[in-house]
């Protein structure tokens, strides 16, 4: 058993049929010694008396808010949550496996630049009695500070018969060094509590591996005289790290017909312009990627050829 | 060349070669073999490798003030990785394919380190750590980790030379 926060405790249980459970001793936070009784949740049934209560925690029915009283007055509370371990593996019932980029990916994170700011998000089908708490650091043995905000519900989607809820959180490394080569990964830890179930999820990454630039901005076409060719030009996104002579991007320019089946013409360039042939009803799209490190491409910025 | 005493390196040549190193490091990575181990092998092998850290002067301001500190750090890393790529980790079982980019990568690391340091002048280099793989699967794991670490190192080096070529070239 360990303390999650004041008066909230997590009991770790090996979860299998006829498992013996864990013996837990609760102590009433009071100077009083006599006449103390214990109850669980809303029930008035007295579970025991005395300053300490010993219980065998085996299942969710044994978890909940234990309260000690004296003469009708509440002295203190202890909320017991359960953390299930099945066949040596902690349960992951609360969050949905996003399966990208690999199985058992519950948290996904992205950064728009090297400033040390990043966003993480996760999915669940649970709509009520759900709380999240997020902590982060760089490195784990001698952790350096990362400050995270509160997790918020950022999207709701309907998936078949189910509703899916997306939560996200923004974090900022306290003393970021954008030009350095990271040697210690960022660690993100999410505590999830649904009713009386506790779970924790972690992700470990380098900012360089979660970089996804915003799409190029000010995408423009300039027809070339007496030609089907056009000059496409664009600019670095505002959110990208500066100076651009140091934090350089590379670009992919694509000409795509109306039909998805039509052959796509693609050009790769380090410049912020390119000359392409504009076909009727086609569109021109440009996306960006770090020039020197193959993290994610940005989403496409697009303009119609006409 | 980064002639001792502080004159400038051939920024444009260094830029071109470092960008080539980036490409080679990424093309070598998936080709060192099928690898599920990399998903789980999360303990850092790279604690002993030279990293370009915050105080090494490789940021734009540091380069403007005195690029020598940064260039020395880059040189140190290049020699270090060149030695690793020539070691038993890459030459032992399982054998790399004959056309593997690792050979080119090895030669390019040496090429860039020589551009930075002419013969006769020696910046101190770092000892290769004893990673002591005894099994082929361990070598394979180390190859992935070393190449991942090299990708990060050469990305920073390439940024340094690109910025130098754009703003510090005579």
């Amino acid at each position: 058993i360990w303390e999650l926060k004041k008066d909230v405790y997590v009991v770790e249980l090996d979860w299998y049929p006829d498992a013996p459970g864990e013996m837990v001793v609760l102590t009433c936070d009071t100077p009083e010694e006599d006449g103390i009784t214990w109850t669980l949740d809303q029930s008035s049934e007295v579970l025991g008396s005395g300053k300490t209560l010993t219980i065998q925690v085996k299942e969710f029915g044994d978890a909940g808010q234990y309260t000690c009283h004296k003469g009708g007055e509440v002295l203190s509370h202890s909320l017991l949550l359960l953390h299930k371990k099945e066949d040596g593996i902690w349960s992951t019932d609360i969050l949905k496996d996003q399966k990208e980029p690999k199985n058992k990916t519950f948290l996904r994170c992205e950064a728009k630049n090297y400033s040390g700011r990043f966003t993480c998000w996760w999915l669940t089908t649970i709509s009520t009695d759900l709380t999240f708490s997020v902590k982060s650091s760089r490195g784990s043995s001698d952790p350096q500070g990362v400050t995270c905000g509160a997790a918020t519900l950022s999207a709701e989607r309907v998936r078949g018969d189910n509703k899916e809820y997306e939560y996200s959180v923004e974090c900022q490394e306290d003393s970021a060094c954008p030009a350095a080569e990271e040697s210690l990964p960022i660690e993100v830890m999410v505590d999830a509590v649904h009713k009386l179930k506790y779970e924790n999820y972690t992700s470990s990454f380098f900012i360089r591996d979660i970089i996804k630039p915003d799409p190029p901005k000010n995408l423009q076409l300039k027809p070339l005289k007496n030609s089907r060719q056009v000059e496409v030009s664009w600019e670095y996104p505002d959110t990208w790290s500066t100076p651009h002579s140091y934090f350089s991007l590379t670009f992919c320019v694509q000409v795509q017909g109306k039909s998805k089946r039509e052959k796509k013409d693609r050009v790769f360039t380090d410049k912020t312009s390119a000359t392409v042939i504009c076909r009727k009803n086609a569109s021109i799209s440009v996306r960006a990627q770090d020039r020197y490190y193959s993290s994610s491409w940005s989403e496409w910025a697009s303009v119609p050829c006409s | 060349r980064a002639v001792p005493g502080g004159s400038s390196p051939a920024w444009t040549q260094c830029q071109q070669l470092s960008q080539k190193l980036c490409t080679l490091a990424w093309s070598a990575h998936p080709l060192v073999g099928h690898m599920d181990l990399r998903e789980e092998g999360d303990e850092e092998t790279t604690n002993d490798v030279p990293h370009i850290q915050c105080g090494d002067g490789c940021d734009p301001q540091g380069l403007r003030d005195n690029s020598q500190f940064c260039l020395q750090r880059i040189h140190q890393g290049l020699i270090f990785y060149e030695k690793l790529l020539g070691s038993d980790i890459f030459t032992g079982e399982p054998s790399l394919l004959p056309d593997s980019p690792v050979g080119q990568l090895h030669a390019s690391l040496l090429g860039l380190s020589q551009l930075l340091q002419p013969e006769g002048h020696h910046w101190e280099t770092q000892q290769i750590p004893s990673l002591s793989p005894s099994q082929p699967w361990q070598r394979l794991l180390l190859r992935f980790k070393i190449l991942r670490s090299l990708q990060a190192f050469v990305a920073v080096a390439a940024r340094v030379f690109a910025h130098g070529a754009a703003t510090l070239s005579p």
């Epitope: - | 690898m35 303990e43 794991l141």
Partner: antibody
């Protein structure tokens, strides 16, 4: 379909040399390493040695001086030679494929049925 | 050599009940976060069969009632609900250092 089949003498006299051949199919010896493992009657398993994809070998230090493992990739055959046999070498000898280096980390994913070798005069 | 000590030597479990086998190594069998510990099942007259590789990965075709956990020196094989066909001897094996070594085996029977 992956198969490994051991063949060789059933009976060997003390001081003689044992030669066992493992013929494999369904995969190439240039892609997978082969180990030899033995099991004395009613006892546990003992790893003898391995031949890697590139032809290099590692042997169990306890019997290293008596052991040679070689292979012919084109014939898909691996040969175990063990000199100076003794009655304590009586065992079932298995030829075993080591799983893909990058996934299995030394786990042996396919085993032959084994061949029983008795050392007796 | 790395010595692998399995416990218990034998185990009698009722059908449908949980069986747990432990394997302790004389030194760590981890290499940069990868545990080179594997589990095999051997039925009488048959060669061993790979169940779990790298401590916790289920080999394809093996029922999900088998699971493995652990790292460094302490490892566990669990059969969550014992079936009649699970009666066998179970071995752990390390491939972190030469020579590869096996545990002494644990015989699992039905109570």
């Amino acid at each position: 379909q992956v198969t490994l089949k051991e063949s060789g003498p059933v009976l060997v006299k003390p001081t003689e040399t044992l030669t066992l051949t493992c013929t494999v199919s369904g995969f190439s010896l240039t892609q997978y390493a082969i180990s030899w493992v033995r099991q004395p009657p009613g006892k546990g398993l003992e790893w003898l040695g391995v031949i890697w994809t590139g032809g290099g070998t590692n042997y169990n230090s306890g019997i290293k001086s008596r052991l040679t493992i070689s292979k012919d990739n084109s014939k898909s055959q691996v040969v175990l030679t063990m000199t100076n046999m003794d009655p304590v070498d009586t065992a079932r000898y298995y030829c075993v494929r080591e799983g893909d280096y990058g996934s299995y980390a030394g786990a042996m994913d396919y085993w032959g049925q084994g061949t029983t070798v008795t050392v007796s005069s | 050599d790395i010595v692998l000590t399995q416990s218990p030597d034998s185990l009698a479990v009722s059908l449908g009940q949980r069986a747990t086998i432990n394997c302790r190594a004389s030194e760590s069998v981890d290499y940069y976060g990868i545990s080179s510990m594997h589990w095999f099942q051997q039925k009488p007259g048959q060669p061993p069969k790979l169940l779990i590789y790298r401590a916790s990965n289920l080999e394809s075709g093996i029922p999900a009632r088998f699971s493995g956990s652990g790292s460094r020196t302490d490892f566990t094989l669990t059969i969550s609900s014992l079936q009649a066909e699970d009666v066998a001897v179970y071995y752990c094996q390390q491939a972190n250092k030469d020579p590869y070594t096996f545990g002494g085996g644990t015989k699992v029977e039905i109570k």
